[in-house]
Every structure is written in structure tokens, then in C-alpha cells.
Interface confidence: low
């Protein structure tokens, strides 16, 4: 966030940088002396460093130019007084920090830092073997038959010559299974049983552990070599092969380190190789026993129309746009191809029906005309464009279509089984004549369209994938009696036990993704955080945590007040809202440091020029950013004036709110997303907006456009009321 400081700038120097840094560069060997680049042997965690809690742990530092140089030295252990298991490259100071430990070691913790990249030697974190397991450096210490291993440095009960000092680099540590000579059976050890001298350990092959569904587009495993054994090139490197698959350009493709991936609809995962003569090769990843797509990966199946790019289209149209018939997918005539049903098992390549197995812009097929290889089936209508009863007017309270599926593909459950729940959140008798079967309806006057109950206890109800009819301009917020509703509830400054709550920012949440701050959020209820859709790059909720009660993004100095909570569910906002309600695994404990923030009245209007603030730990424009929460002061701007400031290129609607900076060049930026626009009315602070990716960071004269919380207030209340929350 480009901002004024909220707190004094205490530069908390990085623990590891207190060491004396010698500005000596490692020469990079050229010509015949050029060594192989070993950075592909490391797992990278961007913007992360390791902090030693145990002061006895040693580290070594040196000035260098690139992370590749750090990696080569770590791999060779040259000049290091320990076995290097990981290193951090400090991009700002062009410096290596080599470690004899990694993030799994005791006495160490991970910490976020923009200028740091952590690289951990994969051999020390891998729990499977490649080939004979010569490079295995994991911590299994039990043999195949369950006998505990004898330590390598011990001669009891078995004398031997496999001394750690004789096998440098083979990591004969503790009593871990190893294969120092690369013998056929794989890693082994001397056993602690005097009757059994040695035995192999039952460590699986990585190719056995790894499996994929369908053609592996959603595969995010750790296979890092091809089917012929070639090591994969890192996706963030352009040598030896230049390519377009840059991790930062395709953040959703899982381009981590040098792992096999399928970003482009190939039959199975592949990678570029480190062999200059072999640009790319497929990887040997077996198909999972249950070869079906995860629910989360299934595109919404349609038969009559195209949703999105039509990857879920399962209809029977079998001609391209101009009527030329399609070639059968299992035929190689007139066009040879590898888009066969065998190669693309989950893509329903039946007969000669139009399909989109490779992520093209819409369904297509090979044609039966020898002169026209492929064509798009663009005559299939788009689901969003369908007319008649498949669209609704206003907020859809009169919708009488017969769609009975939610936007996530769940089948609606019967209205008559859910009347009790419905009565719980509406205060009038619903029109039973409209609530027939399990069709999508809007009995509670929901501003965001028809919805239905589901049979899934985790998702009690959801919206249906129906759009407003084209050209319908009926406002969804209708306030005839009160043309201007105040945003604040009528109550004045809140008082708890007779003492006004301190005007802190205890509702501010740091959403963590894989141990790093990724977004802001607002605690609106003990178990609920309001944030933005763009904050969730992974579908795995184990990747996320919510930190509450902190001022420092790293939690430094906040130990007494910090609460760390897991995330149990994400509830996505109405279509196009960019909002997410994040359910916490247990309720936050409200205290002096953690509090909730109020929501505005539904459909309210806040006067122009009202002074508001945005808060965040995001991009600040400072390389030595101190990690403290920042604030930028903005003022509310009317939608028309806002549009003018955006040179007429932006038309704001009722779901957006605009605020301009008091100090030019301040405003929200990356890392602030999900955080709140907070305004005060009648001495009450409310979250009136949510920061979502906009049009550049704090661009002078370009006010920020936020999601208008007042427009979604009823949805938020409805979720809080209807979704089950854990008890503390």
C-alpha cells in the first residue's frame, strides 16, 4: 500500500542479516570449467526466508550475483563447514545464506520477506526415491520388515566400514536409510537386531507415489524427471530451452520449481529437460486408481449451451459453424491427431461431437473435409446469452424457469423439505405456488437472483447459474420509502461493559497463504472474515491461515495478542462480486486486540466527500518495508465523478463504490486485496468497501474502485444466518 505510516517505522532488522557480510563474489566457472547448474535440485519458496530460533545453528553467508551460484555451492558443499540442506538468496543485497537445516528442521521457522527466496534441497524433503535411491536423503529409519536402523556412526550391534567420514556427501546421518553405493535394492541400513545385519527399507518409487487423474491438467505433484530419466528444467529458467510458460504469467498452472505439468492440454504432464538436445518430454506418472476428476476440477457440464470456454460441453452438436460434419475423435482419417479418447479419458470424446479437450476458446472438432483440419462449433449458444425463462428480470423474484442446479453444479433439493429453514430467515409467508419441485427461485427477494437449497450440509444453499435478461435495467436495490438510507445502524458509539471499545483496528486480518501474507480481510463476525476472491490461488484450504490481532505482518512483537486460525470453508459471493466469506475453523476470541467491524445497512448511500481509510500490509514502494500495517486516507467520490477521473473508460454500477486519495499516490496495492475501505458515520465505523485488483496501484488522479459492501450486505447476513459455524 502506498501510504503514510500507521505506526512509527521501527526497522526490525532481519535476524540472519546481523552477520558480517563479506562482499566476495563466487566466480562463475566458464568454458571447460563450467559446472552443471544444480538449481533444479531445489524446491523454491518465493518471498520466504528461514529464521533460526536455536542460536546454536550455524549459517554461512556470502555476496553473489545469482541464486544459481548459491545452489551450485550448496550442492557441492564447497567451503561450507556443514552439509548444506537449503539456502536463501537475498535479491536485494545479492547475497547467499547457506543452511545446514531446512524448514522441516527443529529450531527454525519460516518467515515472509519480499527480498528473500528460500531454496530447499529436494533430496532432504522428498519421501520417495528415484531409480535406486542413491540421492535419497530423507528420514525413514525403519527397514522393510519393521526393524529400527542402527546409526551409521555406531558399530553396535554390527561392525562395518560405512563411516560418515568415508562417504562424504552421502549423508550417512543418524540411522536414516541410505544407498551410498547405488545398489540395486535401493536404500538400506544396518539393523538394530543382532540377528539381521542389514536390510533394505521400503521406500516407494516417486513414480509409484505420484498419480494423476484424466490427462493430468490438475496434477500438482513433485515428479521432476521425464519418462526417460532426464531431469526437468525449472519453469522459471530459460536455459537450456527458451519458453513462454513463465510462472508469473500463468499463476494458476502450478509452475513450481521443475515439476512435470500439463498446462496446454497435452495427453499427460511433461516438462522441458536439462538436455539441450531434448526440448521436452512426457513424464511417467501413473493414472490414479480412481481416474475421475475431483469435484473441484469438473467444469460445469452443459448439453444445450456453452458455459465459459465450453470445456464442460457434453451435447451432441457434430458440425462446425458452417455445417461441415466433424471427424470422429477415434478416427485418424482424414486428419491424423493425438486427441484420442484414450489420451483424453475425461473429456468425453465420443462419436464426432464438438468438444473442448485442450482449453481452446470454445468447443471444436476435426472436420471431415480433408482441406479443413479443425473448426470451431461457434453455432452452439452461450448459456449466458440464452433467452426466455433462462434469464430473469430485476432480482428474479418472478423467475419461473425449471433450472434445478446451483452454479457449482449441485442438484437443488425440494423446497417442501426446506420450508423450516426458509422461515428462519424471511419474515413473511412465501408464495408456495411458486416453490414447486426443486426449481431455482427467489422467495426471499434476494438481490442477486434465483437460488435453491442443496442436499449438501456444507453448502446449505447457493445461487443458480442464470443471468439477468439482456437489456434489463430494473434496479435490484429498490428503496421507495427511503431514497437515501444511512449506512450506520441507529446506535451510537458502541459501548462494552460501560467502556467504549478502543479505536483499534482489531478487525484487520492477515490472510496467510503457505506461511506468507497474501491478502487482507475484515473480521465481521467471530467466525467470518470478509475478503476477496483473488486471494485464493489454491483450492486446498490447508494452505491458508488467518492471523488476527497483529500490527506487524510477520507477527513480530504481537505474540501476546496474535490469534492464528485455520480456514474451514470459502463461500464465494454472488456472480461478479469478487467477494468471499471465509469461515474460520473456530471462532476468534474477541479481546483488546481482536474485534469485529460493523456492516453497513443494505443498499445504503454514504455521502460524497466522506473521509474513509484503507488498511493493508501490501506493496508499499519501500524496499526496506518495515512490515507494519499501513493506512491510506481516501474520500468517497460519486460514481459519475469517478468515471470522469477514469477518463470515461469505466462505468460504475450499483455494486461498486469509489474513493479517491487525499494524498496523491496513496492507495491500495497488491497484498492489500481483500482488505477494507472503512468509513465512519454517526460515530460508527463500518466496512463499506473491499479492495480488489483494480487499475494500477495508487495512480495519481485515478480514484480506487472497491466492491460496495452495502450492495452485498443481505447476502452476507444470509450466509452468516444459514451456514453452520463451529462452536468455540
Amino acid at each position: 500500500m502506498w501510504v503514510t505510516k500507521l505506526l512509527p517505522a521501527l526497522l526490525l532488522q532481519h535476524v540472519l542479516l546481523h552477520l558480517l557480510l563479506l562482499p566476495i563474489a563466487i566466480p562463475y566457472a566458464e568454458g571447460q570449467r563450467k559446472r552443471r547448474n544444480t538449481i533444479h535440485e531445489f524446491k523454491k519458496s518465493a518471498k520466504t526466508t528461514l529464521i533460526k530460533i536455536d542460536p546454536a545453528l550455524k549459517i554461512k553467508t556470502k555476496k553473489v550475483n545469482t541464486a544459481d551460484q548459491c545452489a551450485n555451492r550448496c550442492t557441492r558443499n564447497k567451503g561450507l563447514p556443514f552439509t548444506c540442506k537449503a539456502f536463501v538468496f537475498d535479491k536485494a543485497r545479492k547475497q547467499c545464506l547457506w543452511f545446514p537445516f531446512n524448514s522441516m528442521s527443529s529450531g527454525v521457522k519460516k518467515e515472509f520477506g519480499h527480498e528473500f527466496d528460500l531454496y530447499e534441497n529436494k533430496d532432504y524433503i522428498r519421501n520417495c526415491i528415484i531409480g535406486k535411491g542413491r540421492s535419497y536423503k530423507g528420514t525413514v529409519s525403519i527397514t522393510k520388515s519393521g526393524i529400527k536402523c542402527q546409526p551409521w556412526s555406531s558399530m553396535i550391534p554390527h561392525e562395518h566400514s560405512f563411516l560418515p567420514s568415508s562417504y562424504r556427501g552421502k549423508d550417512l546421518q543418524e540411522n536414516y536409510c541410505r544407498n551410498p553405493r547405488g545398489e540395486e535394492g535401493g536404500p538400506w541400513c544396518f539393523t538394530s537386531n543382532p540377528e539381521v545385519r542389514y536390510e533394505v527399507c521400503d521406500i516407494p518409487q516417486c513414480s509409484e507415489v505420484e498419480c494423476m487423474t484424466c490427462n493430468g491438467e490438475s496434477y500438482r505433484g513433485l515428479m521432476d524427471h521425464t519418462e526417460s530419466g532426464k531431469i526437468c528444467q525449472r519453469w522459471d529458467h530459460q536455459t537450456p530451452h527458451r519458453h513462454k510458460f513463465l510462472p508469473e504469467r500463468y499463476p494458476d498452472k502450478g509452475f513450481d520449481d521443475n515439476y512435470c505439468r500439463n498446462p496446454d492440454g497435452q495427453p499427460r504432464p511433461w516438462c522441458y529437460t536439462l538436455d539441450p538436445h531434448t526440448r521436452w518430454e512426457y513424464c511417467a506418472i501413473k493414472t490414479c486408481a480412481d481416474n475421475t476428476m475431483n469435484d473441484t476440477d469438473v467444469p460445469l457440464e452443459t448439453t444445450e449451451c456453452i458455459q465459459g470456454q465450453g470445456e464442460g460441453y457434453r451435447g451432441t452438436v457434430n458440425t462446425i459453424w458452417n455445417g461441415i460434419p466433424c471427424q470422429r475423435w477415434d478416427s485418424q482419417y482424414p486428419h491424423e491427431h493425438d486427441m484420442t479418447p484414450e489420451n483424453f479419458k475425461c473429456k468425453d470424446l465420443r462419436e464426432n461431437y464438438c468438444r473442448n479437450p485442450d482449453g481452446s476458446e470454445s468447443p471444436w472438432c476435426f472436420t471431415t473435409d480433408p482441406n479443413i483440419r479443425v473448426g470451431y462449433c461457434s453455432q452452439i449458444p452461450n448459456c449466458d446469452m440464452s433467452h426466455g425463462q433462462d434469464c430473469y428480470r430485476g432480482n428474479g423474484k418472478n423467475y419461473m424457469g425449471n433450472l434445478s442446479q446451483t452454479r457449482s453444479g449441485l442438484t437443488c433439493s425440494m423446497w417442501d423439505k426446506n420450508m423450516e429453514d426458509l422461515h428462519r430467515h424471511i419474515f413473511w409467508e412465501p408464495d408456495a405456488s411458486k416453490l414447486n419441485e426443486n426449481y431455482c427461485r427467489n422467495p426471499d427477494d434476494d438481490a442477486h437472483g434465483p437460488w435453491c437449497y442443496t442436499g449438501n450440509p456444507l453448502i446449505p444453499w447457493d445461487y443458480c447459474p442464470i443471468s439477468r435478461c439482456e437489456g434489463d435495467t430494473t434496479p435490484t436495490i429498490v428503496n421507495l420509502d427511503h431514497p437515501v438510507i444511512s449506512c450506520a445502524k441507529t446506535k451510537q458509539l458502541r459501548v462494552v461493559n460501560g467502556i467504549p471499545t478502543r479505536t483499534n483496528i482489531g478487525w484487520m486480518v492477515s490472510l496467510r497463504y503457505r506461511n506468507k501474507h497474501i491478502c487482507g480481510g475484515s473480521l465481521i463476525k467471530e467466525s467470518w472474515v470478509l475478503t476477496a476472491r483473488q486471494c485464493f490461488p489454491s483450492r486446498d484450504l490447508k494452505d491458508y491461515e488467518a492471523w488476527l490481532g497483529i500490527h506487524d505482518v510477520h507477527g513480530r512483537g504481537d505474540e501476546k495478542c496474535k490469534q492464528v486460525l485455520n480456514v474451514s470453508q470459502l463461500v464465494y459471493g454472488p456472480e461478479g462480486s469478487d467477494l468471499v466469506l471465509m469461515k474460520l475453523a473456530r471462532p476468534a476470541v474477541l479481546d483488546d486486540f481482536v474485534s469485529t467491524i460493523d456492516l453497513p445497512n443494505y443498499g445504503c448511500t454514504i455521502p460524497e466527500k466522506t473521509s474513509c481509510s484503507v488498511y493493508g500490509w501490501g506493496y508499499t514502494g519501500l524496499i526496506n518495508y518495515d512490515g507494519l500495517l499501513r493506512v491510506a486516507h481516501l474520500y468517497i467520490m460519486g460514481n459519475e465523478k469517478c468515471s470522469q477521473h477514469h477518463r470515461g473508460k469505466v462505468t460504475l454500477n450499483e455494486s461498486e463504490i469509489c474513493a479517491g486519495a487525499e494524498k496523491i499516490g496513496s492507495g491500495p496495492c497488491e497484498g492489500d486485496y481483500g482488505g477494507p475501505l472503512v468509513c465512519e458515520q454517526h460515530k460508527m465505523r463500518m466496512v463499506l468497501g473491499v479492495i480488489v485488483p483494480g487499475r494500477g496501484c495508487a495512480i495519481p488522479n485515478r480514484p480506487g474502485i472497491f466492491v460496495r459492501v452495502a450492495y452485498y450486505a443481505k447476502w452476507i447476513h444470509k450466509i452468516i444466518l444459514t451456514y453452520k459455524v463451529p462452536q468455540s
Epitope: 502506498w2 517505522a9 526497522l11 535479491k91 536485494a92 543485497r93 519480499h114 527480498e115 506493496y619 508499499t620 514502494g621 519501500l622 524496499i623 526496506n624 518495508y625 499516490g665 496495492c669 494500477g696 496501484c697 495508487a698 495512480i699 495519481p700
Partner: antibody, heavy 122, light 107 residues
């Protein structure tokens, strides 16, 4: 070899406009924050504007805010400075500058162009 | 805004001598300071970054020291090619500001 070549300077009336360009070569332009720095006839150096590597963030000191606009075309490896409502105190040698690469761009200015002279006559 | 005060404004010295130029920041800028050298008719060149680090190609007779608010640039055994102007600059957030400069002349 890193090269920054400015152009577009000249004599302009007070209140007039001018657009400076800077052609960059010898490095991956799109990876670096870029700045314009000017040197007054009294030899004082003043930072005028910067732009982030992708062009999403720009920043100016109060003395030029609202009058100068920095922009870049990464496809053409070119940096621009559009100057309007020029004043006599804007008379200076204008340098195109590369900032050392870093996540935030708040780094020392490691390469400077040869400069282009702007004279504003009243 | 952070003010950078450089002293002395000018200095007249002989070849072979050692000189020290100082720069004071109006608030703590940690080690976010650079020194530049400008020869007559040329553009400035980076001499020191991060207060103490020399870029490749800068002779070792130049050295930077200091952190926080007090910084200095030392030139040992002055050579004829070292004459010109020297500027300090902070990059602890915007606006970046430069010192007023120190003009080094041959005695």
C-alpha cells in the same frame, strides 16, 4: 552493454508542452523500474518521476505532480516523460535513469543516459 | 520529505591526498543511500550503493560508510580522474532526494 539514449528536449515557451523519450538497450527493460532525474543550471539534481517495471505504478514529487506524466512501452523498450504547463524552473538537463532491479524498485540508480536539455523561456 | 545535507560544498585538494565527504539525512534512512560521481560535461555515475557497497568497476580507493542519518564517502590517494562533483541520494521511499553536491577541485 546498457545504453539509455534520451531525445525530445529543446526550447519551449512557458505554459507549453514537451515529450521526452528514452530508448533503452542492453538489458531486459521490462524487469526494471525507471526514473527521470533532472539537473538544474545550478547543478542541483532533482528526481522527477518513476515508473514500475510493468508500468502499473508511477510516482512524482510535488513540484511536478499533475503536470508531468511518466509512461513506458515495454514492447518498444522506451520510456517517456510528457511535460505540460511548463515553467521556467523546469529548465534543466533531463536524464533517463535505470534503477537497480528489486521487488520494489527503491534502489540506487545504476545507469544514466547522456541527458537531453530542456529550456523553458518566459 | 527527507532532506539530504552534504558537506563541504566544495573542496580543493592535491593528487595523492585523502578526502572525506559527508552527508546527513533528516531522518533515519538505514543504509538506503547512494553516492554518485559526475565529471564535467558528463552524466552522473553510481559510485556506492546501500551506503557501503561498490559496484563492479569502481576502484577500491573509494569507500562508503555510515548508516541511519550520518554517511561519508572517503577517497584514498586521490587520482587526477577523481576530480568532479559528488552527490549523495537516499532511496528510502519517495520522493528520492539528492544532497546539494560537493565540488572537488585540483589545488
Amino acid at each position: 552493454e546498457v545504453q539509455l539514449v534520451e531525445s525530445g528536449g529543446g526550447l519551449v515557451q512557458s505554459g507549453g508542452s514537451l515529450k521526452l523519450s528514452c530508448a533503452a538497450s542492453g538489458f531486459t527493460f521490462s524487469n526494471y523500474f525507471m526514473s527521470w532525474v533532472r539537473q538544474t543550471p545550478e547543478k542541483r539534481l532533482e528526481w522527477v518521476a518513476y515508473i514500475s517495471s510493468g508500468g502499473g505504478s508511477t510516482y512524482y514529487p510535488d513540484s511536478v505532480k499533475g503536470r508531468f506524466t511518466i509512461s513506458r512501452d515495454n514492447a518498444k523498450n522506451t520510456l517517456y516523460l510528457q511535460m505540460s504547463s511548463l515553467k521556467s524552473e523546469d529548465t534543466a538537463m533531463y536524464y533517463c535513469v535505470r534503477q537497480g532491479d528489486g521487488y520494489y524498485g527503491d534502489y540506487a540508480m545504476d545507469y544514466w543516459g547522456q541527458g537531453t536539455s530542456v529550456t523553458v523561456s518566459s | 520529505d527527507i532532506q539530504m545535507t552534504q558537506s563541504p560544498a566544495s573542496l580543493s585538494v592535491s593528487v595523492g591526498e585523502t578526502v572525506t565527504i559527508t552527508c546527513r539525512a533528516s531522518e533515519n534512512i538505514y543504509s538506503n543511500l547512494a553516492w554518485y560521481q559526475q565529471k564535467q560535461g558528463k552524466s552522473p555515475q553510481l559510485l556506492v550503493y546501500d551506503a557501503t557497497h561498490l559496484p563492479d568497476g569502481v576502484p577500491s580507493r573509494f569507500s562508503g560508510s555510515g548508516s541511519g542519518t550520518q554517511f561519508s564517502l572517503k577517497i584514498n590517494s586521490l587520482q587526477s580522474e577523481d576530480f568532479g562533483s559528488y552527490y549523495c541520494q537516499h532511496f528510502w521511499g519517495t520522493p528520492y532526494t539528492f544532497g546539494g553536491g560537493t565540488r572537488l577541485e585540483i589545488k
